[in-house]
């Protein structure tokens, strides 16, 4: 079998809301993946599991099941949303993200995603990690491919 390539394209949108009483930030982050099937037969994308970390703490998780199938030598673009919550011991970030004296409130998040594909009863997992800047002070939407090169640094292999 040939490879199945997973490419993390980047953040498609980040929608922010706040709970002032709880000093909590809610970030709904939609990411885009390109999955390429280099085989001469179809493969199923069984599930996508994703998580987002801030300062080494997991702030959000998501799982998509029975997503799609990808035909021979074909590629599919898949969006997935991870609802994240920055709260409790990280509530100090609420002050930063709602700071009225500045307009740009960048934070670095680590996006982790694992794609499980199956073909002929065989299962394969491919994982990707990227560090991304997100502005926790405002809503952001991207045109296709606009955020492709946003990774701050590649994680250690």
């Amino acid at each position: 079998p040939r490879s199945i390539d997973v490419k993390y394209i980047g953040v498609k949108s980040a929608y922010v809301s706040y709970d002032v009483q709880k000093r909590t930030i809610y970030l709904n982050i939609t990411n885009t993946l390109n999955i390429t099937n280099n085989n001469y037969y179809s493969v199923e994308v069984e599930n996508i599991t994703a998580q987002v970390q801030f300062a080494k703490t997991v702030i959000g998780k998501a799982r998509l099941n029975n997503i799609t199938h990808i035909g021979p030598l074909d590629m599919k673009q898949i969006d997935y949303t991870v609802p994240t919550v920055i709260a409790e011991e990280m509530s100090y970030m609420y002050d930063f993200c709602t700071l009225i004296s500045i307009k740009v409130h960048n934070i670095v998040l680590m996006m982790q995603v694992t794609v499980t594909t199956t073909y002929f009863g065989h299962s394969e997992q491919i994982s990707q990690e990227r560090y991304q800047y997100v502005d926790c002070g405002r809503n952001t939407t991207y045109q296709l491919g606009q955020s492709e090169y946003l990774n701050v640094l590649q994680p250690q292999q």
């Epitope: 953040v11 980040a14 922010v16 706040y18 002032v20 993200c97 709602t98 009225i100 004296s101 500045i102 307009k103 740009v104 409130h105 960048n106 991304q132 800047y133 997100v134 502005d135 002070g137 405002r138 809503n139 952001t140 939407t141 991207y142 045109q143 606009q146 955020s147 090169y149 946003l150 701050v152």
Partner: antibody, heavy 118, light 113 residues
Framework: EVQLQQSGPVLVKPGASVKMSCKAS????????IHWVKQSHGRSLEWIGV????????NYNQKFKGKATLTVDKSSSTAYMELNSLTSEDSAVYYC???????????WGQGTTLTVSS | DIVMTQSPSSLSVSAGEKVTMSCKSS????????????LAWHQQRPGQPPKLLIY???TRESGVPDRFTGSGSGTEFTLTISSVQAEDLAVYYC?????????FGAGTKLELK
């Protein structure tokens, strides 16, 4: 329906002060910042400053520090701007504008016309 | 402060024409972290308050017709109206939304021939 209802036109003498209001309705007042913008006759727009109704935090354009004072009354969901030591240069339309925290201006009030003349 | 320069100051057009107006900033409006340009376009019709058209340089506000398109990056931005309608006659302002103090261009006035 979101509304920012501003007080009516004012005519004042040079040297006086004026306090204009912006009453918010149709949303949770404390969840959004209120900005104030000046538009002199036939001219562009100037940002005066912003206030957070939740905690009264403010940020002023240096140019308007000492000229404008921004306040809010949470109980009536009303934002105020006081302008002091008025001169003819202060004659303008003043808008209050809403933003969800650091997001973009999404709703503008209808404006308050201030005329400073002796 | 970031200075916003718009050109031309006025445009005379016929209904159905395509129109392009320019906005230049004295400093970059690109958030180098998330690669988003923090520029907005507002439309002000005669006797009315301004109204948000476009934010993030290229994202149309909800309810804004798709004949309005924003583009550009860094310090150079463009607002295009693909086919001008009578209701588009207004003054268009670009706005720095990247850093305080927020600043506006002097405006481009769109008039009918």
């Amino acid at each position: 329906e979101v509304q920012l209802q501003q007080s009516g036109p004012v005519l004042v003498k040079p040297g006086a002060s004026v306090k204009m209001s912006c009453k918010a309705s149709g949303y949770t007042f404390t969840d959004y910042y209120i900005h104030w913008v000046k538009q002199s006759h036939g001219r562009s727009l100037e940002w005066i400053g912003v206030i957070s109704p939740y905690n009264d935090n403010t940020n002023y354009n240096q140019k308007f520090k000492g000229k404008a004072t921004l306040t809010v009354d949470k109980s009536s969901s009303t934002a105020y701007m006081e302008l002091n030591s008025l001169t003819s240069e202060d004659s303008a339309v003043y808008y209050c504008v809403r933003t969800y925290y650091s997001n973009y201006f999404d709703y503008w009030g209808q404006g308050t016309t201030l005329t400073v003349s002796s | 402060d970031i200075v916003m320069t718009q050109s031309p100051s006025s445009l005379s057009v016929s209904a159905g024409e395509k129109v392009t107006m320019s906005c230049k900033s004295s400093q970059s409006l690109l958030n180098s972290g998330n690669q988003k340009n923090y520029l907005a376009w507002h439309q002000q019709r005669p006797g009315q308050p301004p109204k948000l058209l476009i934010y993030g340089a290229s994202t149309r506000e909800s309810g804004v017709p798709d004949r309005f398109t924003g583009s550009g990056s860094g310090t150079e931005f463009t607002l295009t109206i693909s086919s001008v309608q009578a209701e588009d006659l207004a003054v268009y302002y670009c706005q720095n939304d990247h850093s305080y103090p927020l600043t506006f261009g002097a405006g481009t006035k769109l008039e009918l021939k």
